[in-house]
């Protein structure tokens, strides 16, 4: 059976919603009205690894789109691309390393940690209209919390 | 013993408010994905919202979205539906039901709690 | 949206029988399938899921089988308290929709 994958929009903890910057990149800001309509859909997949009650690894790509959030090493540094895939063959249960994310949930806190690089996780600045990003610090000025609303397919 | 009790359903007019509770007991509340699940006099089910175990995940179908909102306390082990706007349409016996968006499945039911909507 | 159709809409059957109820889904789910029960005044019971995965406590009579997007419900040797409206629903994509119910009465 294929990989089972649900539409969503993300959030930051701030509000900031995520939209399209450039055809490879993400960026995070308040939207209101109709400008949410530009917010970014994901298909998120369920996928092959290690998993608990609180941590759920998938994959994030983008609605009707073959490009993937998937982290990688740029200049020695855990970096977060949006890189496109041959989509005959994505999404699959087990997707590469460099695409998997635990999603991890505790206490009304929705974190995406890279199962490439632990402690590495999808990030967002305070400020507005900055690129989504992988950081390595939590609980510092940058936003590593967000929240998750599926809409139907 | 593991089980769901709603309560606040009743009668209530068009465009206006109610707040439905479910008490969850016997298991360990903040570890579950819940939802609401409705059915309309002499009908079938409808899934009408879900959140995730901590509460930062959600989902409305199209028929509710905007006008419900799902939330929880899990101090409290209890778990909300706010239903705005209400609609003759929305007249139904309201179940609490343990599961949702990951698990796909409702394990364990409340008794439900009826809300008539008309003027 | 994936429509769930179940047939019959209403059967009736006697003590002993071999029941079953069909599921159609209007596209592949895949197996991510569920069955409940629900008697009359009732909240509904998880009887199924995964399709054939039987849930904690339920009687072995009752079985679950597929063939393409056909899902089936099979109870062995139909029993009094079987009687109830029956439902499936799918879980492959949101959003999650019920069949419309399965009314099973005695003879």
């Known amino acids: 059976a294929p990989v089972r994958s649900l539409n969503c929009t993300l959030r930051d903890s701030q509000q900031k919603s995520l939209v399209m910057s450039g055809p490879y990149e993400l960026k995070a800001l308040h939207l209101q009205g109709q400008d949410m309509e530009q917010q970014v859909v994901f298909s998120m997949s369920f996928v092959q690894g290690e998993e608990s009650n609180d941590k759920i690894p998938v994959a994030l790509g983008l609605k009707e789109k073959n490009l993937y959030l998937s982290c990688v090493l740029k200049d020695d540094k855990p970096t977060l691309q949006l890189e496109s895939v041959d989509p005959k063959n994505y999404p699959k249960k087990k997707m590469e390393k460099r695409f998997v994310f635990n999603k991890i949930e505790i206490n009304n806190k929705l974190e995406f940690e890279s199962a490439q690089f632990p402690n590495w996780y999808i990030s967002t600045s305070q400020a507005e209209n900055m690129p989504v990003f992988l950081g390595g610090t939590k609980g510092g000025q940058d936003i590593t919390d967000f929240t998750m609303q599926f809409v139907s397919s | 013993e593991v089980q769901l009790v709603e309560s606040g359903g009743g009668v209530v007019q068009p465009g206006r408010s109610l707040r439905l509770s479910c008490s969850a007991s016997?298991?360990?509340?903040?570890?579950?994905?819940m939802s609401w699940v409705r059915q309309a006099p002499g009908k079938g089910l409808e899934w009408v919202a879900y959140i995730s175990h901590g509460g930062a995940g959600t989902y409305y179908p199209d028929s509710v979205k905007g006008r419900f909102t799902i939330s929880r306390d899990n101090s409290k082990n209890t778990l909300f539906l706010q239903m705005d706007s209400l609609r003759a349409e929305d007249t139904a016996v309201y179940f609490c039901a343990r599961g949702g968006v990951y698990k796909g499945y409702f394990d364990l039911w409340g008794q439900g709690t009826p809300v008539t909507v008309s003027s | 949206d994936i429509q769930m159709t179940q047939s019959p809409s209403s059967l009736s059957a006697s003590v002993g029988d071999r029941v079953t109820i069909t599921c159609r889904a209007s596209?592949?789910?895949?197996?991510?399938l569920t069955w409940y029960q629900q008697t009359p005044g009732k909240a509904p019971k998880l009887l199924i899921y995964?399709?054939?995965t039987l849930a904690s406590g339920v009687p072995s009579r009752f079985s679950g089988s597929s063939s393409g997007t056909d899902y089936t419900l099979t109870i062995s040797s139909l029993q009094p308290e079987d009687i109830a409206t029956y439902y499936c629903q799918h879980f492959w994509k949101l959003p999650y929709t019920f069949g419309q119910g399965t009314k099973l009465q005695i003879t």
């Open positions: 596209g592949n789910i895949y197996h991510y």
């Open positions: 995964n399709a054939k």
């Open positions: 016997g298991f360990i509340f903040s570890r579950y994905d």
